[in-house]
């Protein structure tokens, strides 16, 4: 057992038919000596007198909150949630597993630049009942400070017959050295309470991994005299990091025509313009990536050719 | 060039090669996220490799103040990488295959370190730890995980030298 | 020792125009962009316009675009703000702000390193 907070304790059990359970002593957080009553959650019902009560914990039913009495009077609570162990893992029942970029895969993590700040989110089918408290460190064996706002819904989507919620975090490093080369990972780890269950989840990773630039801005085109083609310009993204001339983008431009099918002309290029050939009905497409570092891509900034 | 007594390397040279080995590093090791290296118990490989640390002034400010630093660095960390890939991780068994651009990057690594250090100036160098793992596989993981680490340091010297060139170039 | 000053500011009629400076001293623009931010009294200090003078990239807050330009002399070491077809709401001290290495010319305040002690603005007729 240990604490996950103030008067809030999780117990580590054993999930398998007949465990024997995790046998727990909780002391009434009071100088009273006696006339000390126990009870849990809502119900009436006294479980034992004392200082301290001894339970065995063994199911959900086990969990809750404790409290001891003195002649009517609450003296003190302790909350007890289980961490369940299946087979030696821990059970991952709160969030939903992303798949991407590999299995178990619950945390994902982006950042639009090098400035150590980033944003992790994750799913669920839970709607109700449900906490989730972060922290992050780089490194953890002499962690270095990164600072993680609170966990908020961030989307709702219907997925068949299911509702899915999507929570995400914002965390910033806050000694950030984005012209260094990161030797030490870093760590988020997200606690999940649904209803008396607790679980954790974690993510390791350096900033150069999970670096995706937002979209190239202001993409033009510009036809050229007496031909089919056209200039296309683009601008950097406001978010990505500068100056641009350390912290470089290479971009691929694309024609796309109307059906999926037809052929795509792809242009990679350091440069913000690029010449192509406009099609009729097509689209042409730019994104971004860093110059020196192959992390994700941006999304696509379209515009059409006509 | 950027020697000992402080004049300036080619800058130009130096940004064309180093984004050179950026690709030539990705295409040694283009597997991004599919193998996440970390789990595979780092300690005793990758944290002996010189990394491009925050006081080593490889950044805009640093580099405008004093390049020498930064470059020392960087001459450090190709040398000791250049001596990796000449290494029997690379050279043992299983063997490379005849067009894998290891090879490229391991001679572009030199082309870099001599272009910043010419004959006859020498900086220290960082020792080389004795990484010798008996079995293939091993030996298979440890190319990984080296190569991952190269990616990460030649992209920040990339950098280095695309800043340079745009604004400390004569 | 690292410095930057706003000139510039001052009283204008609404539609009028202003041109803000910032000079900059103790580094280099090529190595740093530069963000402008403005708060009016009793309101939050907001971001106006950014640049990174190495390639000229600039940013604009949706309330200025079209109206304000940023650009700079790297000769002079100099960011400048053209305000043209100010509006009363556009009063409020500017400030010129170097921003951190590594993060974008959109970047907060809290991005900043070093900070001008402003100019006053005031749109009135």
């Known amino acids: 057992i240990w604490e996950l907070k103030k008067d809030v304790y999780v117990v580590e059990l054993d999930w398998y038919p007949d465990a024997p359970g995790e046998m727990v002593v909780l002391t009434c957080d009071t100088p009273e000596e006696d006339g000390i009553t126990w009870t849990l959650d809502q119900s009436s019902e006294v479980l034992g007198s004392g200082k301290t009560l001894t339970i065995q914990v063994k199911e959900f039913g086990d969990a809750g909150q404790y409290t001891c009495h003195k002649g009517g009077e609450v003296l003190s609570h302790s909350l007890l949630l289980l961490h369940k162990k299946e087979d030696g893992i821990w059970s991952t029942d709160i969030l939903k597993d992303q798949k991407e970029p590999k299995n178990k895969t619950f945390l994902r993590c982006e950042a639009k630049n090098y400035s150590g700040r980033f944003t992790c989110w994750w799913l669920t089918t839970i709607s109700t009942d449900l906490t989730f408290s972060v922290k992050s460190s780089r490194g953890s064996s002499d962690p270095q400070g990164v600072t993680c706002g609170a966990a908020t819904l961030s989307a709702e989507r219907v997925r068949g017959d299911n509702k899915e919620y999507e929570y995400s975090v914002e965390c910033q490093e806050d000694s950030a050295c984005p012209a260094a080369e990161e030797s030490l990972p870093i760590e988020v780890m997200v606690d999940a309470v649904h209803k008396l269950k607790y679980e954790n989840y974690t993510s390791s990773f350096f900033i150069r991994d999970i670096i995706k630039p937002d979209p190239p801005k202001n993409l033009q085109l510009k036809p050229l005299k007496n031909s089919r083609q056209v200039e296309v310009s683009w601008e950097y993204p406001d978010t990505w990091s500068t100056p641009h001339s350390y912290f470089s983008l290479t971009f691929c431009v694309q024609v796309q025509g109307k059906s999926k099918r037809e052929k795509k002309d792809r242009v990679f290029t350091d440069k913000t313009s690029a010449t192509v050939i406009c099609r009729k009905n097509a689209s042409i497409s730019v994104r971004a990536q860093d110059r020196y570092y192959s992390s994700s891509w941006s999304e696509w900034a379209s515009v059409p050719c006509s | 060039r950027a020697v000992p007594g402080g004049s300036s390397p080619a800058w130009t040279q130096c940004q064309q090669l180093s984004q050179k080995l950026c690709t030539l590093a990705w295409s040694a090791h283009p597997l991004v996220g599919h193998m996440d290296l970390r789990e595979e118990g780092d300690e005793e490989t990758t944290n002996d490799v010189p990394h491009i640390q925050c006081g080593d002034g490889c950044d805009p400010q640093g580099l405008r103040d004093n390049s020498q630093f930064c470059l020392q660095r960087i001459h450090q960390g190709l040398i000791f990488y250049e001596k990796l890939l000449g290494s029997d991780i690379f050279t043992g068994e299983p063997s490379l295959l005849p067009d894998s651009p290891v090879g490229q990057l391991h001679a572009s690594l030199l082309g870099l370190s001599q272009l910043l250090q010419p004959e006859g100036h020498h900086w220290e160098t960082q020792q080389i730890p004795s990484l010798s793992p008996s079995q293939p596989w091993q030996r298979l993981l440890l190319r990984f995980k080296i190569l991952r680490s190269l990616q990460a340091f030649v992209a920040v010297a990339a950098r280095v030298f695309a800043h340079g060139a745009a604004t400390l170039s004569p | 020792e690292v410095q930057l000053v706003e000139s510039g500011g001052g009283l204008v009629q609404p539609g009028g125009s202003l041109r803000l400076s910032c000079a900059a001293s103790?580094?280099?623009?090529?190595?740093?962009?530069i963000a402008w931010f403005r708060q009016a009294p009793g309101k939050e200090r907001e971001g106006v316009s950014g640049?990174?003078?190495?390639?000229?990239?600039?940013y604009y807050a949706d309330s200025v675009k079209g109206r304000f330009t940023i650009s700079s002399d790297n000769a002079k070491n100099t960011v400048y703000l053209q305000m043209n077809s100010l509006r009363p709401e556009d009063t409020a001290v500017y400030y010129c702000?170097?921003?951190?290495?590594?993060?974008?010319?959109?970047?907060?305040?809290?991005?900043?390193?070093?900070w001008g002690k402003g100019t006053l603005v005031t749109v009135s007729s």
């Open positions: 640049i990174d003078s190495g390639d000229g990239s600039t």
């Open positions: 103790g580094f280099y623009l090529d190595d740093y962009a």
């Open positions: 702000a170097r921003v951190r290495t590594g993060w974008g010319l959109n970047a907060p305040d809290y991005a900043m390193d070093y």
